[in-house]
């Protein structure tokens, strides 16, 4: 069910050399809570480097140090996990490099139980002090969302105490979690209050709830597991770009579309146009024209520059990006003002990048 009629073909074409795009998946930097992490921005000839985390500007603070091309995170916590980017601004252009930070105590595949402090989790109570279950180490439960690459081992912990000693059971998506629910089953280390799943697969995604109970009460805690597949993804476009713009008749304007793709992307700039005085084809779908697309003869396809604009140039401009996996598109509006009105660039929207399936 096509959503438009094309004045020009928008099928997949030969793409331009990948000088402007990050072609591999973001590198993943893994740190354990409390560790320090140092990442170097892998961009050349950077006059000015700016950093973002999950699309939001990142500035220095008591734990984040930004020195030249280096980002240092001291005493990492699970909250430091996310999609980071460094942007190198040059006199003629800018370039962005993405990387992931994952602060987790999930043990890697093949490692044995890494709890050296297990004994202190298993609290023995004076037999006279009857007590409902309680958490003994909430720090180890802070990180609720665990995004783990496929084939890794995952460990969820719910260190607890109580008298009599509570029992622990696990639910997946609110239902009893049985060994036969996953290939290879799982391990429960009661003395460490932990659930261990080795070699996770996409079907392991979901909510895992530990229920800790004794005759005096019951407490529970839920973790969400997301299994990140090692497979290529369709393009991701930086949120808020292209940005709406306005200019006067005769003025110049630029639209920018920032692309992240782990397979060579093909970029098209498309505009709604009229054909034979009509904006819509006989099928009722709008006519679109490809103004620019990436290719051997096209320089910097991420930027659409319009010079000496007329009122006819006003309208919606679509940045459409495709690779062999899929597509993404975002649009912006150009407002063309009469000469006597002063132009002004409309406020750019800043938002976290969309994470696309």
């Amino acid at each position: 069910r096509p959503s438009f009629s094309l004045v020009e073909d928008t099928t997949l074409e030969p793409e331009e050399p990948p000088t402007k795009y990050q072609i591999s998946q973001p590198e993943v930097y893994v740190a354990a809570p409390g560790e320090s992490l140092e990442v170097r921005c892998l961009l050349k000839d950077a006059a000015v480097i700016s950093w973002t985390k999950d699309g939001v500007h990142l500035g220095p603070n008591n734990r984040t140090v930004l020195i030249g091309e280096y980002l240092q995170i001291k005493g990492a916590t699970p909250r430091d996990s996310g999609l980071y980017a460094c942007t190198a601004s040059r006199t003629v252009d800018s370039e962005t490099w993405y990387f992931m930070v994952n602060v987790t105590d999930a043990i890697s595949s093949g490692d044995d139980e890494d709890d050296t402090d297990g004994a202190e989790d298993f609290v023995s109570e004076n037999s006279n002090n009857k007590r409902a279950p309680y958490w003994t180490n909430t720090e180890k439960m802070e990180k609720r969302l665990h995004a783990v690459p496929a084939a890794n081992t995952v460990k969820f912990r719910c260190p607890a105490g109580g008298n009599p000693m509570p029992t622990m059971r696990w639910l997946k998506n609110g239902k009893e979690f049985k060994q036969e629910h996953r290939i290879g089953g799982y391990k429960v280390r009661n003395q460490h209050w932990s659930l261990i799943m080795e070699s996770v697969v996409p079907s392991d995604k979901g909510n895992y709830t530990c229920v800790v109970e004794n005759e005096y009460g019951s407490i529970n805690h839920t973790y969400h597991l997301d299994v990140v597949e090692r497979s290529p993804h369709r393009p991701i476009l930086q949120a808020g770009l292209p940005a709406n713009a306005s200019t006067v008749v005769g003025g110049d304007v630029e639209f920018v579309c920032k692309v992240y793709s782990d397979a060579q992307p093909h970029i098209q700039w498309i505009k709604h146009v009229e054909k034979n005085g009509s904006k819509y084809g006989p099928d009722g779908l709008p006519y679109l024209k490809v103004l620019k697309h990436s290719g051997i003869n096209s320089s910097n396809a991420e930027v659409l520059a319009l010079f000496n604009v007329t009122e006819a140039d006003a309208g919606e401009y679509i940045c459409k990006v495709s690779n062999y996996i899929g597509q993404a598109n975002q649009s912006a509006w150009l407002t063309v003002l009469p000469k006597q009105q002063a132009p002004g660039r409309e406020k750019e929207i800043t938002a976290s990048p969309d994470y696309l399936e």
């Epitope: 997949l12 793409e15 990948p18 072609i23 369709r234 060579q264 062999y324 899929g326 597509q327 399936e357």
Partner: antibody, heavy 113, light 107 residues
Framework: QVQLVQSGAEVKKPGASVKVSCKAS????????IHWVRQAPGQGLEWMGA????????SYNQRFKVRATLTADTSTSTVYMELSSLRSEDTAVYYC??????WGQGTTVTVSS | DIQMTQSPSSLSASVGDRVTITCRAS??????LNWYQQKPGKAPKLLIY???NLADGVPSRFSGSGSGTDFTLTISSLQPEDFATYYC?????????FGGGTKVEIK
């Protein structure tokens, strides 16, 4: 989990048409290209074309542009590949693939008089 | 169209051997290359994407290298289940052409 299930084997006469279906499940159907690849007996792999179910965008190998038609039905998460004016050299196994990462089991099309 | 040439077309090897398959593109395809494994009567299986990235569930004995026009698939220690035909594929531009295949047989 991601699954692509293709329709069953077909036997056709030269000049006829064949329509092979590929039903997808386990992911957001509209987010990925579905590619079609064929393999003649004892031969290598040949890319035929692709469709993006979200908007119906298609891309074809020029060798098949005249004879192949790709369509998608988002209501049933199914993609169809129709090949017309069949000849004996079209005898092959036809595969659908989600972005080349997940593949259907293949559909054998035999063209014989 | 971009032509993909694989070599050798077949090879004989023993379990435990290190196996290298090469693929050459007729023009620069940067890192836009996938590798597949296919066993008789089965669909191809993605092994490597983007020339060097290991696909989901693929053992680490498989690795890919190269960029531009010359690429290599390496199996560090051949296992019994690795005897199959391997294909490279250009995913830079349409048509997404495949190499002719390399059949890995038991010596």
């Amino acid at each position: 989990q991601v699954q692509l299930v293709q329709s069953g084997a077909e036997v056709k006469k030269p000049g006829a048409s064949v329509k092979v279906s590929c039903k997808a499940s386990g992911y957001i159907f509209t987010n990925y290209y579905i590619h079609w690849v064929r393999q003649a007996p004892g031969q290598g792999l040949e890319w035929m074309g692709a469709i993006y179910p979200d908007n119906g965008d298609t891309s074809y190998n020029q060798r098949f542009k005249v004879r192949a038609t790709l369509t998608a039905d988002t209501s049933t998460s199914t993609v169809y590949m129709e090949l017309s004016s069949l000849r004996s050299e079209d005898t092959a196994v036809y595969y659908c693939a989600r972005a080349f990462t997940y593949w259907g089991q293949g559909t054998t099309v035999t063209v014989s008089s | 169209d971009i032509q993909m040439t694989q070599s050798p077309s077949s090879l004989s090897a023993s379990v435990g051997d290190r196996v290298t398959i090469t693929c050459r593109a007729s023009e620069n395809i940067y890192g836009a290359l996938n590798w597949y494994q296919q066993k008789p009567g089965k669909a191809p299986k993605l092994l490597i994407y983007g020339a060097t990235n290991l696909a989901d569930g693929v053992p680490s004995r498989f690795s890919g290298s190269g960029s531009g026009t010359d690429f290599t698939l390496t199996i560090s220690s051949l296992q019994p289940e690795d005897f199959a035909t391997y294909y490279c594929q250009n995913v830079l531009s349409t048509p997404y052409t495949f190499g002719g295949g390399t059949k890995v047989e038991i010596k």
